[in-house]
Interface confidence: low
């Protein structure tokens, strides 16, 4: 439906205060290294000129598309060449080339500073004196460094933000109350950028089908109740939000998302008996509530699969009619059927499923040639669950320090062009699949894990995109979304690479690590242990264990030690030559 | 055009050896895993062994310790050592080339595959 001004449109849908931060959002998205104030000040430019165009939609350019608008704004920013350089370009563009080319230049590592929580009663000071400034730079500093944030999620996170110091800045132990608070946003926050970040990878990477498929298979697990048509309807309103999200179309997101959300709970009896404590939720918090929602128990007495998908006569007409639709009901049929697998999996047994049909339909005997199909979606099936098993096992049996040094080690060994910190950071979170998935029963195992690790994977490829240094990852990245986990796992040693020169200064270690917390120590640890992989690829465990082990011991006698400064010297050089003696190096 | 070629198959006794070979053409050989694969008649085709592009080698149980997969890279081949055989391994011997390992393990859309060869036991 059109609108003779999207602008006032998208403002009156979404009101001021939801209007301002998600520009503000969007606008820290494009332009990553500009500074809180500037944004601002775009932002509220924007926003009184979206009110003159609410007051009279036939005004000046309130016709133009936002695209227009907002990249006339960015591109009014006078340090745009200095700052971003080749960026700059993308202002002599017309839309929509020119979004096109913002969207181009996000960062998924931008040059930030890390941020430093201040102390407690520093931020609540903070807080009280300008409550909105301090939130609209929460919002800043998340979107920055996280440019495909989902920006109505953002929304969500700020709320909590916002709860979490009018509650803990008034009680007795701040601290206390806040800290582990904030602590708790920054893990989901870090979850929630990663994951859709995967869902953008999806659909700028492998196009909207794929991100469709993605959908039908979580949606159908998720609301086995749902007639198809229901799900279909909700899968083509959720690829259009996302679309838009990513996409940088961020008011039209959220307001598409919240169009959703009310639609979801206007539907209820005929989606899901799930939804109802969700339903009864203020917006925010009501779309966060569906999209994390449990799934739905199955329907009882659901008939085999095989007699519409294999033992019809009509698989091959019914295929032929309508490819994508049938193929979509087989997966949602699947699906629902099992929310036990992965969503991965699923659909890699769609793929196994639409070949086999390819094949057979031109086949001189269609129902001979595909009648055995289910048979080979058996050893899809148990790769997954044979990987899990035996990497819970390594986990219960090391612990989730020990078993994401393991990883590193073999991620090291497999992809060793890869940077330090990236390789450091990939196998943190691939390691966390334990603490995360390891608890459940096996029937949650695999949707909980190998889902997991395609988003962590996706870090990985999104990183490496930036700087190429790995065919090897480039390939398990760009040949198939849903085959990357079994692609890297394929992956074994670079018999290719030639072994880091050695380097003492990078086993050189101060005194300053004593006072880092328990996680930054480890990754301390953990990028020596990189290094020294990178050093000697062919090292055994024992002798990085050895190595480990040794390094644990000389971090705590010199963190004891009165002279911390001088035993780091001296040690250092002890355990250096040890360690290059002990692996030849 | 990538073609995979294997040979070596026939009539063998029980307790017998044979050695299969499969020529590759058309693909960078030494990135490629490989595998060999069986099928028995009214069976399903199943892995048996598979050699990957750094030379780590797996079999199946039925296979362990009595085959040996190995490659020449400089001959574009990989071969089959079958040694004690039984009548249970009477079969057509595929041979089939993938980028990944767990591709050809699993018989996960396998990019290449040969014509196959006989190989029959008698007891």
């Known amino acids: 439906d059109a609108h003779k001004s999207e602008v006032a449109h998208r403002f009156k849908d979404l009101g001021e205060e939801n209007f301002k931060a998600l520009v503000l959002i969007a606008f820290a998205q494009y332009l990553q290294q500009c500074p809180f104030e500037d944004h601002v000040k775009l932002v509220n430019e924007v926003t009184e000129f979206a009110k003159t165009c609410v007051a009279d939609e036939s005004a000046e350019n309130c016709d133009k598309s936002l695209h227009t608008l907002f990249g006339d704004k960015l591109c009014t920013v006078a340090t745009l060449r200095e700052t971003y350089g080749e960026m700059a370009d993308c202002c002599a563009k017309q839309e929509p080339e020119r979004n096109e080319c913002f969207l181009q230049h996000k960062d998924d590592n931008p040059n930030l500073p890390r941020l430093v929580r201040p102390e407690v009663d520093v931020m609540c000071t903070a807080f009280h004196d300008n409550e909105e400034t301090f939130l609209k730079k929460y919002l800043y500093e998340i979107a920055r460094r996280h440019p495909y944030f989902y920006a109505p999620e953002l929304l969500f996170f700020a709320k909590r933000y916002k709860a979490a110091f009018t509650e803990c800045c008034q009680a007795a132990d701040k601290a206390a109350c806040l800290l582990p608070k904030l602590d708790e946003l920054r893990d989901e926050g870090k979850a929630s950028s990663a994951k859709q970040r995967l869902k953008c990878a999806s659909l700028q990477k492998f196009g909207e089908r794929a991100f469709k498929a993605w959908a039908v298979a979580r949606l159908s697990q998720r609301f086995p109740k749902a007639e198809f048509a229901e799900v279909s309807k909700l899968v083509t309103d959720l690829t259009k939000v996302h679309t838009e999200c990513c996409h940088g179309d961020l008011l039209e997101c959220a307001d598409d998302r919240a169009d959703l959300a009310k639609y979801i709970c206007e539907n209820q009896d005929s989606i899901s008996s799930k939804l109802k404590e969700c339903c009864e939720k203020p917006l925010l918090e009501k779309s966060h509530c569906i999209a994390e929602v449990e799934n739905d128990e199955m329907p009882a007495d659901l008939p085999s699969l095989a007699a519409d998908f294999v033992e019809s006569k009509d698989v091959c007409k019914n295929y032929a009619e309508a490819k994508d639709v049938f193929l979509g009901m087989f997966l949602y049929e699947y699906a629902r059927r099992h929310p036990d697998y992965s969503v991965v999996l699923l659909l890699r047994l769609a793929k196994t499923y639409e070949t086999t049909l390819e094949k057979c339909c031109a086949a001189a005997d269609p129902h001979e040639c595909y009648a055995k199909v289910f048979d080979e979606f058996k050893p899809l099936v148990e790769e997954p669950q044979n990987l899990i098993k035996q990497n819970c096992e390594l986990f219960e049996q090391l612990g989730e320090y020990k078993f994401q040094n393991a990883l590193l080690v073999r991620y090291t060994k497999k992809v060793p062009q890869v940077s330090t910190p990236t390789l450091v950071e990939v196998s943190r979170n691939l390691g966390k699949v334990g603490s995360k998935c390891c608890k459940h029963p096996e029937a949650k195992r695999m949707p909980c894990a190998e889902d997991y690790l395609s988003v962590v994977l996706n870090q990985l490829c999104v990183l490496h995109e930036k700087t190429p240094v790995s065919d090897r990852v480039t390939k398990c990245c760009t040949e198939s979304l849903v085959n990357r986990r079994p692609c890297f796992s394929a992956l074994e040693v670079d018999e290719t690479y030639v072994p880091k020169e050695f380097n003492a200064e990078t086993f050189t270690f101060h005194a300053d690590i004593c006072t880092l917390s328990e996680k930054e120590r480890q990754i301390k640890k953990q990028t020596a242990l990189v290094e020294l992989v990178k050093h000697k690829p062919k090292a055994t465990k024992e002798q990085l264990k050895a190595v480990m082990d040794d390094f644990a011991a000389f971090v705590e006698k010199c963190c004891k030690a009165d002279d911390k400064e001088t035993c780091f010297a001296e040690e250092g050089k002890k355990l250096v030559a040890a360690s290059q003696a002990a692996l030849g190096l | 055009e990538v073609q995979l070629v294997e040979s070596g198959g026939g009539l063998v006794q029980a307790g017998g050896s044979l050695r299969l070979s499969c020529a590759a053409s058309?693909?960078?050989?030494?990135?490629?895993?490989m595998g060999w694969f069986r099928q028995a008649p009214g069976k399903q085709r199943e892995y048996v062994a598979v050699i990957s592009s750094s030379d780590t080698t797996y079999y199946t149980n039925s296979a362990k310790g009595r085959f040996t997969i190995s490659r020449d890279n400089a001959e574009n081949t990989v071969y089959l050592q079958m040694n004690s055989l039984k009548p249970e391994d009477t079969a057509v011997y595929f041979c089939a080339a993938d980028s990944y390992v767990t591709a050809l393990q699993t018989l996960t859309q396998i990019s290449y595959w040969g014509q196959g060869t006989q190989v029959t036991v008698s007891s």
């Open positions: 058309g693909l960078s050989f030494s990135k490629y895993a």
